[in-house]
């Protein structure tokens, strides 16, 4: 029972995590214009992995996709790749784990087969979560580097009469969604791996043995005794918090930008 609960919870947690990774990948707010210590502008810039947007104070939002592949920074391409790999692995993991669930009977599938599938999906979830966390962290690192570079530019080279508003970018909502989602997928994967141990019982069947008592022809046959050892069945209650992310896509598509570097 505990094994089923652990496996089921692992599946649900991973499902939420992968949904979060997909949401984060699609979100436009990976980086948002830094408003602190900047002139108050009547426009707000934010960028995603696939397009960048500008929201005007008047209410109009315009987004433009990055229609170039070669012109984009290698780091951005790497983040895209990591997120997509994470989604693909997670999706395959979910598919495998559905068939591995103890509560679902498919034909005459052996427990050992289910255990192997549970382990496989668990590993896939772990790798998927790590991919998402890595992708988001690489992007965050890129933002931090660019932030300090643009901050340095703000305080140097101001000898000219004309000032230019230096748009600096900071962490967007998608980064936090990605981190939380990656973490959930990772936890779900670990839970699946733990559940796998409980699904692979070591079976010892004691065959019937005849004891001949002297003078009597009475055979003593104890019933077939099955000893199963359950590992890792003491799953603790975990409260999972899903960072409620809101994607805002009120786009009335008009134009935008590609300046990550």
């Amino acid at each position: 029972m505990a094994v089923t609960a652990c496996q089921g919870l692992g599946f649900v947690v991973s499902l939420i995590g992968i949904a979060g990774i997909i949401a984060a990948t699609c979100m436009d707010q990976w980086s948002t214009q830094d408003l602190y210590n900047n002139p108050v502008t009547a426009v707000f810039n934010y960028q995603g992995l696939w397009r960048s947007c500008v929201r005007e104070s008047s209410g109009f939002t315009e987004c433009r996709g990055y229609f170039t592949l070669l012109g984009l920074p290698a780091m951005l391409q790497a983040v895209r790749a990591l997120m997509i790999v994470g989604i693909v692995l997670g999706a395959i993991g979910l598919l495998v784990s559905i068939f591995a669930l103890k509560c679902i009977r498919i034909g005459s599938m052996e427990d050992s087969a289910k255990a192997n599938m549970t382990l496989t999906s668990g590993i896939m979830f772990i790798v998927s979560g790590l991919c998402a966390i890595a992708g988001v962290s690489v992007f965050a690192n890129m933002l931090v580097t660019n932030f300090w570079m643009s901050t340095a530019n703000m305080y140097t080279g101001m000898g000219g009469m004309v000032q230019t508003v230096q748009t600096r970018y900071t962490f967007g909502a998608a980064l936090f969604v990605g981190w939380v989602a990656g973490g959930l997928t990772l936890i779900g994967g670990v839970m699946m791996c733990i559940a796998c141990r409980g699904l692979a019982p070591e079976e010892t069947n004691y065959k019937a043995v005849s004891y001949h008592a002297s003078g009597h022809s009475v055979a003593y046959k104890p019933g077939g005794f099955k000893a199963s050892t359950g590992f890792g069945s003491n799953t603790k209650n975990k409260k999972i918090y899903d960072g409620g992310a809101r994607t805002e896509d009120e786009v009335q598509s008009y134009p935008s930008k590609h300046d990550y570097v």
């Epitope: 008047s58 433009r64 930008k257 300046d259």
Partner: antibody
Framework: QVQMKESGPGLVAPSQSLSITCTVS????????VTWVRQPPGKGLEWLGV???????NYHSALTSRLRISKDKSKSQVFLKLSSLQTDDTATYYC???????????WGQGTSVTVSS | DIVMTQSPSSLTVTAGEKVTMRCKSS????????????LTWYQQKPGQPPKLLVY???TRESGVPDRFTGSGSGTDFTLTVSSVQAEDLAVYYC?????????FGAGTKLELK
């Protein structure tokens, strides 16, 4: 179709407060903002402030302490309140709707306000 | 605050003539996010409210005759009237629509010879 109409007192005594109402139709105040602009007689345009669809406001730095802009979405009305009036506050006051590029695409006809004792 | 400087303050022209007025801002009005310049041009005739002509420095508002052309980027902008008509006689204002407060220029008055 978008329409905007300002209504004000016409004459206000110095040191008093000025209250002007802008009644709009053809668009929602929850979605779009309303900007206030004034024009002293024979002079240029002066941007006063704006209230955006989400209720946030921005004011001209020189008027921050004296100016308040608010709205009543249910009545489709925007209010301008300018306190401690001086004679140089005499102007035609316009309300306008910001559109694409934050440009003011619709304007009211304006209401003339004279600050005099 | 951003200072918007318009030149010349007045222009006397003959009908059919090409006219150019300038607007200079003390800070760049170019938004890196969409590579658009948040500068707007208005036309105001006597006794009337201003009328929007051009936004984003070069995008003509619908219904505005194509003889009006906005151009420029960063801090220097121009409004060109290719062939001045009698109905174009008015005061033309530029406005910063990028950094608060959204200041106006002092205006350029277009007069007929």
């Amino acid at each position: 179709q978008v329409q905007m109409k300002e209504s004000g007192p016409g004459l206000v005594a110095p040191s008093q407060s000025l209250s002007i109402t802008c009644t709009v139709s053809g668009f929602s105040l929850t979605t779009y903002g309303v900007t206030w602009v004034r024009q002293p007689p024979g002079k240029g345009l002066e941007w006063l402030g704006v209230i955006w669809g989400d209720g946030s406001t921005n004011y001209h730095s020189a008027l921050t302490s004296r100016l308040r802009i608010s709205k009543d979405k249910s009545k489709s009305q925007v209010f301008l309140k300018l306190s401690s009036l001086q004679t140089d506050d005499t102007a035609t006051y316009y309300c306008a709707k910001p559109g694409r590029g934050n440009a003011l695409d619709y304007w009211g006809q304006g209401t003339s306000v004279t600050v005099s004792s | 605050d951003i200072v918007m400087t318009q030149s010349p303050s007045s222009l006397t022209v003959t009908a059919g003539e090409k006219v150019t007025m300038r607007c200079k801002s003390s800070q760049s009005l170019l938004n890196s996010g969409n590579q658009k310049n948040y500068l707007t041009w208005y036309q105001q005739k006597p006794g009337q409210p201003p009328k929007l002509l051009v936004y984003w420095a070069s995008t003509r508002e619908s219904g505005v005759p194509d003889r009006f052309t906005g151009s420029g980027s960063g801090t220097d902008f121009t409004l060109t009237v290719s062939s001045v008509q009698a109905e174009d006689l008015a005061v033309y204002y530029c406005q910063n629509d990028y950094i608060f407060p959204l200041t106006f220029g002092a205006g350029t008055k277009l007069e007929l010879k």
